[in-house]
């Protein structure tokens, strides 16, 4: 039997946010139902995790031996602290799209561990704020965006923006 440390060395985690409780659930991406030591985990989920606080989970299973895999859960900031904002200027709305993630509230997570991603059609941007220029007037554009904390996606949003009519004579 492999050690649990080896077996779950590359375990990945998804963070799910509860807007009512303002707490996260960490979903462990494993095929079998594991045990989590002192932390209670139900169906491979660790519940009631506070934003920006680390939690340590000891993962074991009867298919592997000691030592257990110690997984540090780096809990992201609360999702409601981010808003995807349309920053397009009215006078340029016929050929321009501007989108920006706004941090409407501070948090204690390290901001340097946060990355932003936008995908508009086949264009990808790793920025917090994007401005697309020289677009076709009266066209519909779809932009998908996500925010990652330590490379774990914890929130996403999509915007469908229709550029305005062009000025007469253009």
């Amino acid at each position: 039997k492999p050690t649990c440390d080896e077996k779950y060395a590359n375990i990945t985690v998804d963070y799910l946010y509860n807007k009512e409780t303002k707490l996260f659930t960490a979903k462990l991406n494993v095929n079998e139902t594991v045990e989590c030591g002192n932390n209670t985990c139900t169906n491979n989920e660790v519940h009631n995790l506070t934003e920006c606080k680390n939690a340590s989970v000891s993962i074991s299973h009867n298919s592997c031996t000691a030592p257990d895999k110690t997984l540090i859960l780096d809990v992201p900031p609360g999702v409601e602290k981010f808003q995807l904002h349309d920053c397009t200027q009215v006078e340029k709305a016929d050929t321009t799209i501007c989108l920006k993630w706004k941090n409407i509230e501070t948090f204690t997570c390290d901001t340097q561990n946060i990355t932003y991603r936008f995908q508009c059609g086949n264009m990808i941007f790793d920025n917090k704020e994007i401005k697309l220029e020289n677009l076709e007037p009266e066209h519909e554009y779809k932009c998908d965006s996500e925010i990652l904390y330590n490379n774990h996606k914890f929130t996403n949003a999509s915007k469908i923006i229709k550029t305005d009519f062009g000025s007469p004579g253009e």
Epitope: C98, T111, T115
Partner: antibody, heavy 119, light 113 residues
Amino acid sequence: EVQLVESGGDLVKPGGSLKLSCAASGFAFSNYDMSWVRQTPEKRLEWVAYISSGGVSTYYPDTVKGRFTISRDNAKNTLYLQMSSLKSEDTAMYYCARRYDVWWYFDVWGAGTTVTVSS
Amino acid sequence: DVLMTQTPLSLPVSLGDQASISCRSSQSIVHSNGNTYLEWYLQKPGQSPKLLIYKVSNRFSGVPDRFSGSGSGTDFTLKISRVEAEDLGVYYCFQGSHVPMYTFGGGTKLEIK
């Protein structure tokens, strides 16, 4: 190490122009809004310019509006302040400072660069 | 513009004493989102300013707990419970509520009596 290093300060004549630079390192520059703040010889601190993370939004106080232009090159991790029609009251130590968003705080400051406007 | 007025201009203290600095804004700096973006910075001799307190009373990481901020509306206070030699310098309050018209207070110099 997170660092901001200003350069470009000099002695200039009234009416002259000057461009300041601020080189950022140790952090994802393109995720941070940035500002220029100056300190007068009397030690007063004055905010002079603000730019959003992607360079989309810029803000200035009335004292420098139309004379100063803040810009950034995220590929070069550099912030700029183009100053024109300089006046003696623009004499100051100029600091660049980062602010994660408008509702945050200035958590990292550079050491400053000195601008002297005098004939 | 929002005017930030600090008192006193100079504050002579003995090491170990409590120090209190006042900052008054010319209008309310409570933002429509309910937050008050009042910050305190310390500039030690020969250095650039450093953040101490944000949003009235939140200590920035690494700031000793002898520093505390309080207040609401237009009146704010920074207290240092037991002044140490490393606390000497000029303290500035700052309002970030009226974006984008940021303003600093005039500064208070904390010095040894």
